[in-house]
């Protein structure tokens, strides 16, 4: 559920890497090497404010191997995860007291991903196994994209359902994935 | 020693198919992606698809789809690619060439296959 | 696509001195800090041979003189100093994007 089979011009299925809200812990060799916002991007929002670090959409990098049943890839790949908050909510004047509050409402702007590159990858596998040629589909950008909710569900449906808009009021948590939901993801391919 | 050996040049006659061989040898055949790539005069070097010979999936530039058909026979570490309804714009030399892990490039290419459409 | 520009179409060096091929793509082919730009040699009769990976990276058997730099979009091949065999037609190609793109060839001749 984490992710879907995306139908590419090939024959081939490549397994879409569903939005990470949060880097999972399980991945090796964490490389957090965290770019310009947005990918060097300017934020894609309709906010005023001076301070960009609220617009945080990351991009980090992870690497680890992709695994096909007992066959691993000769080297780790490098894979982008999309990971933060796109901006506060929209702020609102507070009739009570003259002051100035949060609202979640409005629109909702999620950090996902953007575009995707194939990667090719060389699976070696034991008992004298051939080896097997592989290509897997790796986020390669990251993005602050405007939800409604008119659209936010159809927007996301390529991402997963980590990424439904969280409840009111609610600090939206990422959901954990297990070590093997994440080894799904990478699995296969072309 | 890696190497891809191709089949010979062709002469055709336009509206006609061919079928252009590519004997790999000196490495897992399954282990790599094979990808065939264009040379003519007016359009240097152009990328027209690859396979994986382990799955026989295949990936095709746009602009090829309908004109090439990319096959493996897995049993000679043969790839081939078939061109059909050959005009003469298709006239031009065709490589198969590997696609590599380290370095992440086309690092083995076979010798050419000359494909010459003339009535 | 990613479309990638080469300059100069054609040059002339003497031997001994130094040629510079530049190659310029539509968009960045970085990714996770490793530049996807690769350098090929080709000469009349022949396939293309790889010389250059990952912007800078020599490929085996390929002599020092040959050497790659850039990152983003914009990537340089050297020659120096410029041998008799080494009169070509080099071809820039990305690898970062599907699908594989090449330059449009920089034919090196000698003076």
């Known amino acids: 559920q984490g992710w879907q089979a995306f139908k590419n011009d090939a024959t081939e299925i490549i397994p879409e890497l569903g939005e990470y809200p949060e880097p999972p812990p399980e991945l090796e060799n964490n490389k957090t090497m965290n770019r310009a916002e947005n990918g060097g991007r300017p934020p894609h929002h309709p906010f005023e404010t001076k301070d960009v670090s609220e617009y945080s959409c990351r991009e980090l990098h992870f690497t680890r191997y992709v695994t096909d049943g007992p066959c691993r890839s000769a080297k780790p790949v490098t894979e982008l995860v999309c990971s933060g908050q796109c901006g506060p909510a929209r702020l609102l004047p507070n009739a009570i007291g003259r002051g100035k509050w949060w609202r979640p409402s409005g629109p909702d702007f999620r950090c996902i991903p953007d575009r995707y590159r194939a990667q090719r990858v060389q699976l070696l596998c034991p008992g004298g196994e051939a080896p097997r040629a592989r290509k897997v589909r790796l986020v390669a950008s990251c993005k602050c994209k405007r939800l409604t909710r008119f659209h936010n569900q159809s927007e996301l449906k390529d991402f997963g359902t980590e990424a439904a808009r969280p409840q009111k009021g609610r600090k939206p948590r990422p959901r954990a994935r297990s070590a093997k939901a994440n080894q799904a993801e990478l699995e296969n391919a072309y | 020693e890696v190497q891809l050996q191709q089949s010979g040049p062709e002469l055709v006659k336009p509206g006609a198919s061919v079928k252009i061989s590519c004997k790999a040898s000196?490495?897992?055949?399954?282990?790599?992606?094979m990808h065939w790539v264009k040379q003519s005069p007016e359009n240097s070097l152009e990328w027209i698809g690859e396979i994986n010979p382990s799955t026989g999936g295949t990936t095709y530039n746009q602009r090829f789809k309908g004109k090439a058909t990319l096959t493996v026979d897995k049993s000679s570490s043969t790839a081939y690619m078939q061109l059909k309804s050959l005009t003469s714009e298709d006239s031009a030399v065709y490589y198969c060439?590997?696609?590599?892990?380290?370095?992440?490039?086309?690092?083995?290419w076979g010798q050419g296959t000359s494909v010459t459409v003339s009535s | 696509d990613i479309v990638l520009t080469q300059s100069p179409a054609s040059l002339a060096v003497s031997l001994g001195q130094r040629a510079t091929i530049s190659c310029k793509a539509s968009q960045s082919v970085d990714y996770a800090g490793d530049n996807y730009m690769n350098w090929y040699q080709q000469k009349p009769g022949q396939p293309p041979k790889l010389l250059i990976y990952?912007?800078?990276n020599l490929e085996s058997g390929i002599p020092a003189r040959f050497s790659g730099s850039g990152s983003g979009t914009d990537f340089t091949l050297n020659i120096h100093p410029v041998e008799e065999e080494d009169a070509a037609t080099y071809y820039c190609?990305?690898?970062?994007?599907?699908?594989?793109?090449f330059g449009g060839g920089t034919k090196l001749e000698l003076k």
């Open positions: 000196g490495y897992p055949f399954t282990g790599y992606f």
């Open positions: 990952t912007a800078s």
């Open positions: 060439t590997r696609w590599g892990y380290n370095p992440y490039a086309l690092d083995y």
């Open positions: 190609q990305q690898s970062n994007e599907d699908p594989p793109t």
